[in-house]
C-alpha cells in the first residue's frame, strides 16, 4: 500500500495509506510553515519549502538523526510549489510572491529563473521528465493551468475555462493524464496532457482541497478545511474515504514510491550532456538544452556558460 509523504506546516510526515492503524510518522519536525514537498526516491531524499523561513530545505529518510540542510535560502518569498526532477536531478519551484518559476541543481546551485512574466499566483508544479514537460497552476486574476518544456521552451496555456482556484496538480505518468483540484469550484477534474478531453472525477463535495497525488487507481488529496487527507478512485471518484484526520494543517502531498519516479536514460547523464552548468530536459530534439544560471549567458557553442557563472 502506498506511503504518503505530506507537509503539515510544523512538520513533514509519512502515513501508510493502507495501514490498519492510520497513524502518521514524523519525518522532520520543528518547522515554521512547510508548504510544498517532494522527494528523490533513489537517494531517499526529501525536499520541502518553508514559506515563513523563505527557504527550500532537504533531509534524508531512513537515516537516524539525518541533518536538515538548506538548499535555497535567498531570493524566495512564498515558494508555494516544488517538484523534483528525478531524472535530470533538478529542483523546480514556483514562488507566488516573486512571480517566478525557477530551476536549480538538487543542491541549489546553478539556479535559473525560467519564467518571470505573466505569472500572478503560481502554485502547484508537476513534471513529466519522460516527455520533457512541466505543468503548473496559477490561481491569480486569470486562473489557468500552463505547460512548458522543462527547459523553459514552448510555454502554453492548456486550461483556462471553468477554473478558479486550481491548487492541486498531479500527473498520471502511465495513462498520461493531468489531474487538478479546484478549491473554489469544489472539484477534481482530469484531462489529457494538452488539456483536451476534460472529465469530472469529483464534483461539489470538496471543501478546500490543496494538494493532489496519485498511486495506481487511487487519488489522494489534502484539505485545508477538514484538516485531513482523502482518497477516491481516479476514474470514477468513487470509493471515497478519509485516510487521516485531525491534522495540524495538511499542505502538499506525494506518494512516496519508485513507481512515481520511473527511471530512464537521458543525454544529460553522459557528461552532463556536454553542458558546463545546467542540462535541462526538453520536449523537442535533442531532448535536452544546456542552460546557464540567471544573469550568465550561454556561449555560441550552446554548451558552455560565459565567465562569471
Amino acid at each position: 500500500s502506498p506511503l504518503l509523504l505530506f507537509a503539515n506546516r510544523r512538520d513533514v510526515r509519512l502515513v501508510d495509506a493502507g495501514g490498519v492503524k492510520l497513524e502518521s510518522t514524523i519525518v522532520v519536525s520543528g518547522l515554521e510553515d512547510a508548504a510544498a514537498v517532494d522527494f528523490q526516491f533513489s537517494k531517499g531524499a526529501v525536499y520541502w519549502t518553508d514559506v515563513s523561513e523563505e527557504a527550500i530545505k532537504q533531509t534524508y529518510l531512513n537515516q537516524t538523526g539525518a541533518a536538515v540542510q538548506n538548499v535555497v535560502i535567498s531570493g524566495l518569498v512564498s515558494p508555494d510549489g516544488l517538484a523534483c526532477d528525478w531524472v535530470g536531478k533538478k529542483l523546480y519551484w514556483t514562488d507566488s510572491e516573486t512571480n517566478r518559476i525557477e530551476v536549480a541543481n538538487l543542491n541549489g546551485t546553478s539556479r535559473k529563473v525560467l519564467f518571470w512574466q505573466d505569472l500572478d499566483q503560481p502554485r502547484a508544479i508537476a513534471l513529466d521528465p519522460a516527455h520533457g514537460y512541466m505543468y503548473w497552476t496559477d490561481w491569480g486574476e486569470t486562473p489557468r493551468i500552463e505547460r512548458a518544456g522543462m527547459d523553459g521552451s514552448t510555454r502554453k496555456i492548456i486550461v483556462d475555462s471553468d477554473i478558479y482556484w486550481p491548487n492541486g496538480l498531479t500527473i498520471d505518468l502511465e495513462e498520461q493524464k493531468l489531474y487538478w483540484a479546484d478549491a473554489k469550484l469544489s472539484f477534481i477534474h482530469r484531462a489529457n496532457l494538452d488539456g483536451s478531453f476534460r472529465q469530472k472525477v469529483v464534483e461539489g463535495s470538496l471543501t478546500h482541497p490543496f494538494a493532489l497525488t496519485l498511486s495506481g487507481d487511487t487519488l489522494y488529496w489534502t484539505d485545508w478545511q477538514t484538516r485531513s487527507i482523502h482518497a477516491c478512485n481516479k476514474r470514477t471518484g468513487g470509493k471515497r474515504k478519509e485516510i487521516l484526520s485531525a491534522l495540524y494543517s495538511p499542505m502538499d502531498i506525494q506518494v512516496l514510491s519508485q513507481e512515481r519516479q520511473p527511471f530512464f536514460h537521458t543525454r544529460c547523464e553522459e557528461d552532463n550532456g556536454g553542458c558546463s552548468h545546467l542540462c535541462l530536459l526538453s520536449p523537442s530534439e535533442p531532448f535536452y538544452t544546456c542552460a546557464c544560471p540567471t544573469g550568465v549567458q550561454l556561449q555560441d557553442n550552446g554548451r558552455t556558460c560565459k565567465a562569471g557563472a
Partner: nanobody, 129 residues
Framework: AVQLVESGGGLVQPGGSLRLSCAAS????????MGWFRQAPGKEREFVAA????????YYADSVKGRFTISRDNSKNTVYLQMNSLRPEDTAVYYC??????????????????????WGQGTLVTVSS
C-alpha cells in the same frame, strides 16, 4: 513610519465582552489584509482572525469561531475585534498585524504570524472572575 496601535483591552469576567480596536497610520490601509493574533504567557503567538482588504472575507481560528468578530472601517484606517462569551483561556496579549500580500482563504500565509509585515505593541486581555 508605519504604526499600529491597539486599544480596548482590560479585565473582564468570563462570559463578558470586549471590543478591541487597532488604528493604523503610515500605510495605505485599504491595501492590507489585517489580522489579530494573541500570545498567552509561555505560549506561542497564535492566529485569531483576519479580514481581507475589501472586508468581504473574514477568517477565524477554530477556538474563537462564533464568539469573535473581526471587522474593518477603511475610512477610519481601523480594524476591530469584537470578543463575546470570553473564557479564561482567551487571556493573552492581543496583537494587530498588517499584511499586504493576503489574498483570501486560498493564500497559504494568511494564518502565519511569520509573514505579517507590521505589528502593533499589543493590548492585554484578562478574563478572570
Amino acid at each position: 513610519a508605519v504604526q499600529l496601535v491597539e486599544s480596548g483591552g482590560g479585565l473582564v469576567q468570563p462570559g463578558g465582552s470586549l471590543r478591541l480596536s487597532c488604528a493604523a497610520s503610515g500605510l495605505t490601509f485599504s491595501r492590507y489584509t489585517m489580522g489579530w493574533f494573541r500570545q498567552a504567557p509561555g505560549k506561542e503567538r497564535e492566529f485569531v482572525a483576519a479580514i481581507v482588504r475589501s472586508g468581504g472575507s473574514t477568517y477565524y481560528a477554530d477556538s474563537v469561531k462564533g464568539r469573535f468578530t473581526i471587522s474593518r472601517d477603511n475610512s477610519k484606517n481601523t480594524v476591530y475585534l469584537q470578543m463575546n462569551s470570553l473564557r479564561p483561556e482567551d487571556t493573552a496579549v492581543y496583537y494587530c498585524a498588517a499584511d499586504r500580500r493576503g489574498r483570501g482563504e486560498n493564500y497559504i500565509l494568511l494564518y502565519s504570524s511569520g509573514r505579517y509585515e507590521y505589528w502593533g505593541q499589543g493590548t492585554l486581555v484578562t478574563v478572570s472572575s
